[in-house]
Amino acid sequence: DLKVEMMAGGTQITPLNDNVTIFCNIFYSQPLNITSMGITWFWKSLTFDKEVKVFEFFGDHQEAFRPGAIVSPWRLKSGDASLRLPGIQLEEAGEYRCEVVVTPLKAQGTVQLEVVASPASRLLLDQVGMKENEDKYMCESSGFYPEAINITWEKQTQKFPHPIEISEDVITGPTIKNMDGTFNVTSCLKLNSSQEDPGTVYQCVVRHASLHTPLRSNFTLTAARHSLSETEKTDNFS
């Protein structure tokens, strides 16, 4: 009996530009002889329904139809037909099919590959055209994929140390698509510093599918109005 097992759940998520290994494990009732078996990997794009051959291994020869694609002969010996794709790109997301032939048997499995890109976040202060005691703080998130993103603003005061979400005077602009397929977005917070307590900490909080934990950038309102800090935590998907 010949069986193929792919990633549990049927979906693999990988960061943009990563060297991804798409899992495919072979279960066979006898020891595998790699000189008398064949492995073919196929890819079907999210945008068009045509299947394309990515890699082929048979007997004493292997061929990559996508540059750098490889199945390890040394791992194949122990039943691992996983496909390594170096430098994965957004457009390579889609359905991957692993087809194994141990004559006369054939088995196959499919997996969905999602490629994500983590946002970079930075805070900017824009005082151009603002009234006295009024500041506009901009939280720029760039280079993320997919498009769905959630940006919120929070504040912590000495009186209320737990973060409170700010809903007023927040404007989040439209997402803009970059040439490389990733997205950018800017969220603005308008503050009247005369009405806020010095020492109040404001945070821009970015949530995205590529992040295990939200990306937080903060600034502290001082008597001298403001003090922008570096992005506190960048926890990219890995």
Partner: antibody, heavy 120, light 111 residues
Framework: EVQLVQSGAEVKKPGASVKVSCKAS????????MDWVRQAPGQGLEWIGD????????LYNQKFRGRVTLTVDTSISTAYMELSRLRSDDTAVYYC?????????????WGQGTTVTVSS | DIVLTQTPLSLSVTPGQPASISCKAS??????????MNWYLQKPGQPPQLLIY???TLHSGIPDRFSGSGSGTDFTLKISRVEAEDVGVYYC?????????FGQGTKLEIK
Amino acid sequence: EVQLVQSGAEVKKPGASVKVSCKASGYTFTDYNMDWVRQAPGQGLEWIGDINPNNGGTLYNQKFRGRVTLTVDTSISTAYMELSRLRSDDTAVYYCARSEVFYGNYADYWGQGTTVTVSS
Amino acid sequence: DIVLTQTPLSLSVTPGQPASISCKASQSVDYDGDSYMNWYLQKPGQPPQLLIYAASTLHSGIPDRFSGSGSGTDFTLKISRVEAEDVGVYYCQQSKEDPRTFGQGTKLEIK
């Protein structure tokens, strides 16, 4: 920085078993196989086998089959080599080595070695 | 099993002079256009370190005075100018077939 840190020296009696650990850091553990190689005093290198942390698949040198068991715990990036029914000629330094498997096959980083002495 | 025979088993070289070690395999270690022959150096009291893989590719961090050549069954490791730090035992290893096997080693000493 890639590092492989092995467990300490062991002294065992003939017939006993020994389990050597190899803690990996500085790279993605599942991207490479782990080779095990031994070296008897004053002798050359002898390949014991390897394990694929991706699926736990193992390949053993026929000479050790039935006596050696290679395992991994991916949650702590650690590989293990257990050798049973020890004999005096199993006295050797045992090495784990990270093994590239996609673009060739070679051991590019090695542990410091674990000395196993089998003596009655 | 593929048997690897290294020659010479020992050599003594003056610093600055070249050195050459041969490794002959009992059968071809080529597969799909590549040669699966690796070279390691084991310095006294240390684990082996990779020098050359795939017959001729220099491992990162290894000085370019080391070079490897050959295909099929005949392989050579060359050191263009031996330095004092090159002392130790040199091993060839094939990784085409299991069990992966090593040569018996060549001991390099400095004159």
